[in-house]
Structures are given as C-alpha cells and as structure tokens.
Interface confidence: medium
C-alpha cells in the first residue's frame, strides 16, 4: 500500500503529461487527482510510465470506482489494461464493440490471457449472443476463439455471423463443436449456388452426416483429401466406394497415401474388396469377396 | 518406376493447333490422373487441366476452356494436349505429370508459335 | 492469372535457414492440401512436399512445409548452394474445380 503523504509545493498535476514521468511514486499517489486522471486517460498511454508508476494509476482508479471501472475510462486504458485482473474485469460492463477492440489491440500478437477471456466474456454476455460484428472482431484477433467455445456457448451463435468464419477459425475445432456449426452454415449459405456453396461449406463439413455427403458426391464438387480426412468417421463409413469416387473426384487416388489413418482406415475395413479394386489404387483390407456382411446395428434395433 | 515420355519440339504457325503426347511407363495408367502444366519463356507454371484415364472425363482451367482438348489412350498408357488456335503468345514448354500432386514429371515439350 | 501469391525472390548465405510464404484463399489453400515443387533451371519441375508437410522419399529434410489458414510456407535450412532454384506452391481451388500455382519465388544462395 502506498502510504497518504501531502504532494510537494508546485507539484499539483494540472493535466496528464509528460512531466509525471519524473514523479516518484508516492509523488503520484499524493499529486495527481483520481478524477483528473479519469477524465485525461486517453492520454496515459502516450506517456511511456514504468511498471510501478502504472500500479499507483491502477490504484487511484480503484479507489475512484471500488463498483467498477465506467465504459468511458475503460476504452482508454491502454497498457493499463494488462495491470488488471480478471477480478477487475468483473465488475466492469462492457457493451461498446469499440471499447473491446481496443482493449484487445493492446493484447495482440499474445495468447489470451485469463484477462482478455474475462472480458469477451463479459462483453458476450452483456450482448446475449455472439453477433457477426463480435465474431468478425474476436476471430481477427484470436483465430482459435470459436474452437474455444463449448458446444453449448456455440449454440448461441447466430447462422447470419457464420458469414464472419474464416477456414483457419475452424483449424482447432473438434467434432463435436462442428456438429453445433454445420447445421447453423449449411442455413446460412442455403441460397448460394453450388460450387459458391461448396466454398462456403466445405470448412464445416467435419459436421456433416452422412446424408449431406451422398448429396455432395451428387454435385461433382471434387473435395480435395485434406477435407475429407476431417469428415466424421461415422457420416463416411456408409458411403459406398462409388459415392467415395464422386465425391473425390480426381482427388480419389489420394486414398491410397491415407489408407493407414482414419476415416479412411475405417471406410475401407466396411468396403468390398472387389469394390475397392475398381478403383485401381491398391487399396487393401475390404471385406473378402464372397463374404456375408451382417449390420449388427440392425440386428440389435429389431431384436 | 514411373516414366514419362512426351513427344518432340514443335514450330507451329498462329492460328493452328498443336497435339502433344505423354506416354506413360512403369505404373498404372488408368487410375491416376494426367494433368497438363505449361510454363512460357521466363515464366511461372500455369496448370491447363487434367483427365483421369478411366473416368474419361477431363476438366479444363478455365482460362484454356473451348481451345484445349485432353484425351487418352489407355490401350497405349498415352495421354495427349491438343491446343487450338495458336497465338505466339503459347510459345512456351508444354509438361505432362501424374497424380493429384505432380509426383511424375515428363521432360517437357517446346512448342514454338511464330509467323 | 495467378491465384496464389509467392514472394518474387528470397535469399540466404550458405547454412542459413530461408522460408517461401504462400497465400492463398478460402477457396484453395484454407481447406485444402498444399504442394511445394522445387524447380532447377532447364529442368522439368520436381515434387518437394505434398499435403502441407510430407516429403517424397530422396528428399532431405532440409525442406520443411507447414499451413496456417489460408497461408503455407516451405522452409529450407542449411542452405546448399544446390539449393538455388525456383519454387513453386500448388494447391487445388474447389471453386474453379482447378489446381492453381504461385507465381514462383527464385531462390539465391549469396
């Protein structure tokens, strides 16, 4: 705590200037007026403080809102921003999409810090939905964002803000988040053209069931293996190898350099070995001609 | 190991065609795709399109769409690139390789369009 | 005409580690698998890496590729002298139904 002592005659801060620089701490505490400070924030990021002389600003602005920090002198915190804790940020109500860009523009190039997850936090739920202007401002910042989302908070995601996902926001998301994407972007993109659609979708189809993909290989889309390697194992093993062959295209004969990983693995294993043998490709570990497939699944359901 | 050998340089006038080969050794032909890659004097490569032999269907950039015709023979494992109305500006060295990444290349084919 | 941008030259000492950035679009490099070729002059090209980051058997892992988004970048370190060339990334473009080049990027060894 830094001690209460009387400012020194002629050292009153009139304004927020360069010349705090030279003052020592307790010179801040007892000179610089909280309120004054309040009202010139935007100024304290142009003035190049040290670590401690921040921690005594911080402090003053404590004390000036033990409730929490207003809108108008959060906006134009600046470094200060990385003084506080995600206990501070708490109590703050953050509803200007201007405000959050700025407190993230100070963090950028950095991991999210427990902070900067506090406050979009905050900032979400203040809005009740993560909006296309929240998304296309989180993902610009933080490309992983969506992917660090629950399947639950996903749900909350408008289709209208799929429009603001990249391919690369997608890169870190698991299935089970793309189950709650997929059907939001297959609405989305519904009245686009088919390859403007395929474009679109493509990002999301590691969602897609298995009826979706037989429509696809309808379509001559031509899904590149890299696509197709993140599709769910469950939705691609009942494609027939035909229905493999079209939705591939020429891309097919990469099966062959991805026969040891799933689904590819997996698809294989439940295929015709003659079947896989039209392809060309050496594929091997088909079901042996003459062999009777029982679905179990079937089986089950009806006993 | 995978060989492919194309057909010899050609001088061509502007307003012809011209018809190159690929012919294919080593592997299997049919079920692996033959893509078509030029590359004029000086310049990058530029991809004109694919046919995958036992589909029978090619598909074009759409830049060479209506003036390149891709076709092949699998009884001889020979794929062909036949370009129309010639200007000097497809002077340039006409390649043929294998599979969706290029993995096989021919040796390339010089084709010269002047007047 | 060219979909994927490469910057035009890159150079490195010999030893030095140098990379070839990539960029692409949503609708070829972002889902999609990306390719590097490596190009000696007067030669056909030659397949350095194929989907992002696998290398052919004979190449040394000198040569190293990776993906970010809609971006792939070929790295090369002990830089050999051998190693000056032209390199060009390849990915495919589901928009066009195409396999799309960069405009290559000539590598010097100083």
């Known amino acids: 705590e830094v001690e209460k002592t009387a400012c020194p005659s002629g050292k009153k801060a009139r304004e927020i200037d360069e010349s705090l620089i030279f003052y020592k701490k307790w010179e801040l505490e007892a000179c610089v007026d909280a309120a004054l400070l309040a009202t010139q924030m935007d100024r304290v990021n142009a003035i190049p403080f040290t670590y401690e002389q921040l921690d005594v600003l911080k402090h003053k602005l404590d004390e000036l809102y033990p409730q929490g920090y207003p809108e108008s002198v959060i906006q134009h915190l600046g470094y200060l921003f990385l003084k506080m804790s995600p206990e501070d940020i708490r109590k703050w109500n953050v509803t200007s999409l201007e405000t959050l860009k700025a407190l993230l523009e100070v963090n950028k190039g950095h991991e999210m810090s427990p902070q900067v997850a506090t406050l979009i936090d905050r900032f979400v739920k203040g809005r009740g939905q993560l909006d296309k202007d929240t998304l296309d401002t989180l993902t610009a910042f933080y490309p992983g964002y969506l992917c660090s989302l629950s399947p639950e908070e996903l749900s909350s995601v408008p289709p209208s803000s799929i429009w603001a996902v990249r391919p690369q926001d997608l890169d870190t998301c698991d299935p089970r988040q793309l189950d709650v994407l997929y059907p939001k972007a297959r609405l989305a993109f519904q009245n686009m053209n088919g390859s403007e659609y395929f474009v679109k979708i493509q990002s999301f189809l590691g969602g897609a069931p298995t009826e979706d993909l037989k429509a696809l290989s309808q379509q001559n889309v031509s899904m590149d293996l890299a696509t197709f390697m993140k599709l769910r194992t469950d939705a691609v093993l009942p494609l027939t190898v035909a229905e493999v062959q079209k939705l591939l295209g020429p891309h097919v004969e990469g099966l062959k350099a991805e026969e040891r990983h799933r689904p590819v693995r997996d698809w294989i294993l439940r295929q015709r070995q003659d079947d896989l043998d039209t392809l060309g490709l050496g594929l091997q570990g088909g079901i042996p001609n003459g062999y009777l497939v029982l679905d179990l699944s079937m089986q089950e359901a009806l006993s | 190991q995978v060989q492919l050998v194309q057909s010899g340089a050609e001088v061509k006038k502007p307003g012809s065609s011209v018809k190159v080969s690929c012919k294919a050794s080593g592997g299997t032909f049919s079920n692996y795709s033959i893509s078509w890659v030029r590359q004029a004097p000086g310049q990058g490569l530029e991809w004109m399109g694919r046919?995958?032999?036992?589909?029978?269907?090619?598909n074009y950039a759409q830049k060479f769409q209506g003036r390149v015709t891709i076709t092949a023979d699998e009884s001889t494992s020979t794929a062909y690139m036949e370009l129309s109305s010639l200007r000097s500006e497809d002077t340039a060295v006409y390649y043929c390789?294998?599979?969706?990444?290029?993995?096989?290349w021919g040796q390339g084919t010089l084709v010269t369009v002047s007047s | 005409d060219i979909v994927l941008t490469q910057p035009p030259s890159v150079s490195g000492a010999p030893g030095q580690r140098v990379t070839i950035s990539c960029s692409g679009s949503s609708s070829n490099i972002g889902p999609n698998y990306v390719s590097w070729y490596q190009q000696l002059p007067g030669t056909a090209p030659k397949l350095l890496i194929h989907?992002?980051?696998n290398r052919p058997s004979g190449v040394p892992d000198r040569f190293s590729g990776s993906k970010s988004g809609t971006s792939a970048s070929l790295a090369i370190t002990g830089l050999q002298s051998e190693d000056e060339a032209d390199y060009y990334c390849q990915s495919y473009d589901f928009f066009t139904n195409s396999s799309v080049f960069g405009g290559g990027t000539k590598l010097t060894v100083l």
């Open positions: 390789a294998r599979g969706i990444y290029f993995a096989f």
């Open positions: 989907g992002n980051a």
């Open positions: 046919i995958i032999p036992n589909f029978g269907t090619a």
